[in-house]
């Protein structure tokens, strides 16, 4: 089959790095300066990405690979391959149109990015606050109320030991 | 514009070797793809070895192995070394720098 789809098609011999080129009658030809095909059987190359502004170049582009883009500190990437760089925040803070705003009481963050989620609501699963939220942190949840009642303890203390051949006075 | 010519052909039994050289002139310093093609009676003309501009060598899955692309900047020249050669070896060299070619250099492989 591979003899066959060569015969038919040149192009389908061209390896990663070159492009079918028309202009030479079909034969391959290596990819121009900053371009590159990362699959053979091309008929272009494509251009290389160029990780310029509050991108910052990761992997540089070869004539067989693209170049990969990260963010500049204090941003990270959102999207496929890092297609756009969003500002980070503090703990505690999220991204809206205006910036960075503090969580709103009753809601925390613990990362750089992303929104504030409400706190744990403990009581749903019948729990008790242990360790109260912050806006930065979550809720701890503790024991049910009625663990922590008055003779409610799930741990029974030992009785008291007596000496054997002793009978009580 | 570049002008390139070949040296270095010949007839060689199978198994040998031969190196290739493609001096170069004219400005060649802002030229950053070097190739060697060959064409087979018959055949249309194949990409070899070359040079990509992220300065690595590649070589077409035939002759990997055998064949070793180099160039030397200060003497303005580009080699290819052919070992172990094969009867389908046989072709006319052609040396290339983005848009200019040389005029080939035959190489016969033959017992």
């Known amino acids: 089959f591979e003899r066959t789809r060569s015969l038919q098609d040149p192009c389908s011999n061209c390896p990663a790095g070159t492009f079918c080129d028309n202009n030479r009658n079909q034969i391959c030809s290596p990819c121009p300066p900053n371009s590159f095909s990362s699959a053979g059987g091309q008929r272009t190359c494509d251009i290389c990405r160029q990780c310029k502004g509050v991108f910052r170049t990761r992997k540089e582009c070869s004539s067989t690979s693209n170049a990969e883009c990260d963010c500049t500190p204090g941003f990270h990437c959102l999207g496929a391959g890092c297609s756009m760089c969003e500002q980070d925040c503090k703990q505690g803070q999220e991204l809206t149109k205006k910036g960075c705003k503090d969580c709103c009481f009753g809601t925390f963050n613990d990362q750089k990015r992303g929104i504030c989620r409400p706190w744990t609501n403990c009581s749903l699963d019948g729990k008790s606050v242990l360790v109260n939220g912050t806006k930065e942190r979550d809720v701890v949840c503790g024991p049910s109320p009625a663990d922590l009642s008055p003779g409610a303890s799930s741990v029974t203390p030992p009785a008291p030991a007596r000496e054997p051949g002793h009978s009580p006075q | 514009a570049v002008q390139l010519v070949e040296s270095g052909g010949g007839l060689v039994q199978p198994g040998g070797s031969l190196r290739l050289s493609c001096a170069a002139s004219?400005?060649?310093?802002?030229?950053?793809?070097w190739s060697w093609y060959r064409q087979a009676p018959g055949k249309q003309r194949e990409l070899v070895a070359w040079?990509?501009?992220?300065?690595?060598?590649h070589y077409t899955d035939s002759v990997k192995g055998r064949f070793t692309i180099s160039r030397d900047n200060t003497k303005k020249t580009l080699y290819l070394q052919m070992n172990s050669l094969k009867l389908e070896d046989t072709a006319v060299y052609y040396c290339?720098?983005?848009?200019?070619w040389g005029q080939g250099t035959q190489v016969t492989v033959s017992s």
């Open positions: 004219g400005n060649i310093f802002s030229i950053r793809v």
């Open positions: 040079f990509a501009w992220d300065n690595i060598a």
């Open positions: 290339n720098s983005e848009d200019s």
